[in-house]
């Protein structure tokens, strides 16, 4: 004959466990139903009587199958720096990540506690790894024969076009020009494997940044002042 | 011109800790980014870590982070990639790169063998 | 992690052909990518950077193409010193990974 399904609550088997989506309830010392996610325990069970489960109110959620007297808050609003990539529903929390600019300066279990905007590599300087999700930019300075003449976060240093005849100069932080009619981006032969830097470290100090194109994280994170090196990289 | 010159190469006995060092000559070590790659023999490359001199962070590949330290000394231009609780996989060259601003490891050293063999 | 799946894995070509590489990310990387050539016993050396930038000192026949998933590295005219094997590798995102390698041989 097959086992009879036995319906919650109902006592275990001495040595055995509660099922799937069941608990076993201290005091009644019986098998008893979990609520849904969504739900949470209004009435604990009894002898007689199974769990007596409600959905959560606004603003609360259960994420799994519980049995939890008060459904959990949801985390507050994104910040400004933040976008909602996962809203507030009675099955799920609220996950704020950073907007595009900026990485996560101090993560926290899904989503990000501290949004910081990423650096921006001045003139003269390129971004040696970029900004990730969880990652600050590093700026290090143009080699000759590159050059960078933007304030950014995602502009690498580039090769100086070739001239015919080179009316001015290139330099770190600005392109040659030309006096011919074709100029070329194609390299220059040679067999350098790596381009000496023009700056120093001296000269790797960022002046004081207009707040529209460099902000500064100074005041966000454990740092001192902002040169264009900083930043860690990582997810 | 800049150069990247690693030490020599080494052996270990598995459980040991290796230390390679890798000399910045010609220019500055604060203006790059210094990674580490292993190459196994007759495999490809993986990227161990990186770090960045003038600030002194690091950033680890998650096979490797519980075992790796990647360190600089900029007053002798060198970086130092440490290696702990060496096994037999751990057999391969050692590499060090630099990274500059056009965003690519544009200078290797010449590699360090490491060999971990009981 | 993002994997970076190169083909064929050994190409045969013969002096003075064309050579085309390929190399796919499992993901976006955007133009992220960078080709090496290693030569046996030797260190690997950047050819081309951000896809399709050619570093410098590097001869004009090596050019790169593609953006977000599919990449190409190709030699227009194989000189005997190109036969190598060579390496595909992403930095848009930790860990940074490389390809498995396209080994360049003389047909």
């Known amino acids: 004959l097959p086992a009879q399904v036995a319906f919650t609550p109902y006592a275990p088997e001495p040595g055995s466990t509660c099922r799937l989506r069941e608990y076993y309830d201290q005091t009644a010392q019986m098998c008893c139903s979990k609520c849904s996610p969504g739900q949470h325990a209004k009435v604990f069970c009894t002898k007689t009587s199974d769990t007596v489960c409600d959905s959560c109110e606004d603003s609360t959620y259960t994420q799994l199958w519980n049995w939890v007297p008060e459904c959990l808050s949801c985390g507050s609003r994104c910040s400004s720096d933040q976008v909602e990539t996962q809203a507030c529903t009675r099955e799920q929390n609220r996950i704020c990540t950073c907007r595009p600019g900026w990485y996560c300066a101090l993560s926290k279990q899904e989503g990000c506690r501290l949004c910081a905007p990423l650096r921006k590599c001045r003139p003269g300087f390129g971004v040696a790894r970029p900004g990730t999700e969880t990652s600050d930019v590093v700026c290090k300075p143009c080699a000759p024969g590159t050059f960078s003449n933007t304030t950014s976060s995602t502009d690498i240093c580039r090769p100086h076009q070739i001239c015919n005849v080179v009316a001015i100069p290139g330099n770190a932080s600005m392109d040659a020009v030309c006096t011919s009619t074709s100029p070329t981006r194609s390299m220059a032969p040679g067999a350098v494997h790596l381009p000496q830097p023009v700056s120093t470290r001296s000269q790797h100090t960022q002046p004081t940044p207009e707040p529209s194109t460099a902000p500064s994280t100074s005041f966000l994170l454990p740092m001192g002042p902002s040169p264009p090196a900083e930043g860690s990289t990582g997810d | 011109e800049v150069q990247l010159v690693q030490s020599g190469a080494e052996v270990k006995k598995p459980g040991a800790t290796v230390k390679i060092s890798c000399k910045v000559s010609?220019?500055?070590?604060?203006?790059?980014?210094l990674h580490w790659v292993q190459q196994a023999p007759g495999k490809g490359l993986e990227w161990m870590g990186w770090?960045?001199?003038?600030?002194?962070?690091?950033k680890y590949g998650q096979k490797f982070q519980s075992r790796v330290t990647i360190t600089a000394d900029t007053s002798t231009d060198t970086a130092y990639m440490e290696l702990s609780s060496l096994r037999s996989e751990d057999t391969a060259v050692y590499y060090c790169?630099?990274?500059?601003?056009?965003?690519?490891?544009?200078?290797w050293g010449q590699g360090t063998l490491v060999t971990v063999s009981s | 992690d993002i994997v970076m799946t190169q083909s064929p894995a050994t190409l045969s070509v013969s002096p003075g052909e064309r050579a085309t590489l390929s190399c796919k990310a499992s993901?976006?990387?955007?133009?992220?990518v960078d080709w090496y050539q290693q030569k046996p016993g030797q260190s690997p050396r950047v050819l081309i950077y951000?896809?399709?930038i050619r570093y410098t000192g590097i001869p004009a026949r090596f050019s790169g193409s593609g953006s977000g998933t599919e990449f190409t590295l190709t030699i227009s005219i194989l000189q005997s010193e190109d036969f190598a094997v060579y390496f595909c590798?992403?930095?848009?995102?930790?860990?940074?990974?490389f390809g498995q390698g396209t080994k360049l041989e003389i047909k």
């Open positions: 951000k896809a399709s």
């Open positions: 590798m992403q930095s848009k995102s930790y860990p940074i990974t």
């Open positions: 993901q976006n990387v955007g133009s992220n």
């Open positions: 010609g220019y500055s070590i604060t203006d790059y980014l």
């Open positions: 790169a630099a990274n500059s601003a056009t965003g690519t490891m544009d200078a």
């Open positions: 770090i960045d001199p003038e600030e002194g962070k690091t």
